[in-house]
């Protein structure tokens, strides 16, 4: 499948999955916490104040990256509680914490958590590269 | 090797407008996140802006919100930022850098600036 | 917006010596705190990402620690190329900030 259509289908996989992940918190647009997301790269799950949300690392990185095998569920939700308890040596987990001013950025970064050959290619099919 | 070279630099009066670019190359450009940093002379880094692989998502320093636009082309490997109603307290050495990842990152990698000055 | 501090502003030292620059951010950042030095008339270069690891091409005598809202920066042994001013920068939340810098110079 083409890359541009395997994002608009994640990306309205997305919108479903936060759409039900609402109803089940009981969320609404007055709600503290964080409403889902997608930040043009991966699904991020609605979060509570103080929740620490994990993903496994996004179908991007299988394009980037095909020779690497990533898991393909989104990690449990069990511990959300110390931003500490990841690894930076554990490949293909990157988190967000949710608190009061909204989400911080990822950690750890992307490429950081997901791997990157950045001299693998240099002349690669710009059409893997220009994902709307 | 990563080469970043910002252009677009000089004098302008206060209200004007004025577009810095940087070339890229020794990377695969359009895999990566941009930002431009400002230092004042003699002063600190200030963060101004950060824009993903693929343009869109941007993101901006407060005191520039609304009045700068980060932009790429990645068919010419380019960053660009647009600097409308400039201030004196713009006035500044602007640096391009590689932020490490393809949404925001950290400037890894960075140009040699070009110095804005922003005077009556 | 989190705000960084770094102290002292500036330090004195001689080569061989151990400089220690510390880094305070308003809130956690986690570890998404990065250090770069600056020389004079030169771009800053990346040292030290996530708090703690180490990146090649940079000496093993640069080391940071810290997590949440305490870094440090420790140069175990001054070189006399050491001599520059550092900054600490946050990638934990938007808009990312640097901080003020410090500087270290020869005694």
């Known amino acids: 499948m083409h890359s541009d259509c395997i994002f608009k289908k994640e990306q309205a996989m997305c919108l479903e999955k936060i759409q039900r992940a609402n109803e089940l918190m009981g969320f609404n647009d007055s709600s503290p916490g964080c409403p889902g997301m997608w930040d043009n790269i991966t699904c991020w799950k609605p979060a509570h104040v103080g929740e620490m949300v994990l993903v496994s690392c996004p179908e991007l990185f299988r394009i980037f990256n095909p020779d690497q095998v990533w898991e393909t569920e989104t990690i449990g939700e069990s511990d959300f509680g110390d931003s500490n308890s990841l690894d930076l040596s554990d490949m293909g987990v990157v988190s967000r914490n949710c608190t009061e001013d909204g989400w911080s950025e990822p950690f750890p970064h992307y490429f950081d958590a997901c791997g990157f050959d950045e001299y693998e290619s240099e002349t690669g099919d710009q059409d893997y590269y220009y994902l709307s | 090797q990563v080469q970043l070279v910002e252009s677009g630099g000089g004098v302008v009066q206060p209200g004007r407008s004025l577009r810095l670019s940087c070339a890229a190359s020794g990377f695969t450009f359009s895999r990566f996140a941009m930002h431009w940093v400002r230092q004042a002379p003699g002063k600190g880094l200030e963060w101004v802006a950060v824009i993903s692989y693929d343009g869109n998502n941007k993101y901006y320093a407060r005191s520039v919100k609304g009045r700068f636009t980060i932009s790429r082309d990645n068919s010419k490997n380019t960053l660009y930022l647009q600097m409308n109603s400039l201030r004196a307290e713009d006035t500044a050495l602007f640096y391009c850098?590689?932020?490490?990842?393809?949404?925001?990152?950290?400037?890894?990698?960075w140009g040699q600036g070009t110095l804005v000055t922003v005077s009556s | 917006e989190i705000v960084l501090t770094q102290s002292p502003a500036t330090l004195s030292l001689s080569p061989g010596e151990r400089a220690t620059l510390s880094c305070r951010a308003s809130?956690?950042?986690?570890?998404?705190l990065h250090w770069y030095q600056q020389k004079p008339g030169q771009a800053p270069r990346l040292l030290i990402k996530y708090a703690s690891q180490s990146l090649s091409g940079i000496p093993a005598r640069f080391s940071g620690s810290g997590s949440g809202t305490d870094f440090t920066l420790t140069i175990s042994s001054l070189e006399p190329e050491d001599f520059a001013v550092y900054y600490c920068?946050?990638?934990?939340?938007?808009?990312?900030?640097f901080g003020p810098g410090t500087k270290v110079d020869i005694k």
């Open positions: 850098a590689r932020g490490y990842d393809i949404l925001t990152g950290y400037p890894d990698y």
């Open positions: 809130q956690s950042v986690g570890r998404s």
């Open positions: 920068h946050q990638s934990s939340r938007l808009p990312f900030t």
